[in-house]
């Protein structure tokens, strides 16, 4: 999906209003210095591409974040403010339902969500030069 035509300001507002708090809740009990940010993004569409990938694509050691509250809200925000996003996700959602696993918070998942927090922070500051 090409995130170029999303309403970035609305997605930012959704993040600041509620998604950010859910990410903090997920990470509660973890020191903010515990994980190094290794994933970066260069502009808002790129940030959303990376956010979508880290949130919804299973990775080694973290089978699924998709049922977490921050993930459900992220998916909803993209569905509302990225034209045509919902339609591209129908097949992906059906595939995900088939391989749904129970929720387990592993250290790998915590690291992944820490990366997500960094991507969201970058998304909210689009005019900053890439380090």
């Amino acid at each position: 999906y090409d995130f170029t035509n999303c309403d970035f300001e609305k997605i930012k507002a959704a993040y600041l209003s509620t998604i950010s708090k859910d990410l903090i809740t997920y990470m509660s009990g973890t020191k903010s210095t515990e994980f190094n940010n290794t994933v970066s993004c260069s502009n808002r569409p790129h940030c959303l591409t990376e956010i979508q990938s880290l949130t919804f694509n299973p990775t080694a050691g973290c089978a699924s974040l998709a049922k977490e509250m921050f993930a459900m809200k992220t998916k909803a925000a993209l569905a509302i403010w990225c034209p045509g996003y919902s339609e591209t996700q129908i097949n992906a959602t059906q595939a995900m339902k088939k391989r749904r696993k129970r929720k387990v918070t592993t250290n790998k998942c915590l690291e992944q969500v820490s990366q997500l927090q960094g991507l969201w922070r970058r998304f909210n500051r689009p005019l900053l030069k890439q380090q």
Partner: nanobody, 132 residues
């Protein structure tokens, strides 16, 4: 140009009723979501109720569930908030607001409808005072 005009506020005794109206113009009403917010002196603006004009989906804040009813008349481009069993705690300025994408994505909007930062257009407000 876009306009939202609220009316119907006033002074009412506890246990009484009021019906607020929000008349909209200047945009494609059927595609939009309209929400009612309220702000009491010294408090933050809070979401009261939401309706999608495209499919009629409605949401309510817990504090008003069972007492307030939101409805929409698309022919008149107007949204109503019927407020029954009013309490002194309901005293506030009431505002309606419109948003252009939540109206056609009402199911996903359950997470976001109550956040004022997401709305594009606002009315000037109408005052509701509930005396004990």
């Amino acid at each position: 140009q876009v306009q939202l005009v609220e009316s119907g506020g006033g002074l009412v005794q506890a246990g009484g009723s009021l019906r607020l109206s929000c008349a909209a113009s200047g945009f494609s009403f059927d595609d939009y979501a309209i929400a009612w917010f309220r702000q009491a002196p010294g408090k933050e603006r809070e979401g009261v109720s939401f309706i999608s004009n495209s499919d009629g989906t409605a949401y309510y804040a817990d504090s008003v569930k069972g007492r307030f009813t939101i409805s929409s008349d698309n022919a008149k481009n107007t949204v109503y908030l019927q407020m029954d069993s009013l309490k002194p705690d309901d005293t506030a300025d009431y505002y309606c607001a419109a948003e252009g994408r939540m109206g056609t994505h009402s199911r996903d909007s359950v997470y976001f409808w109550s956040f004022s930062a997401l709305y594009d257009y606002w009315g000037q407000g109408t005052q509701v005072t509930v005396s004990s």
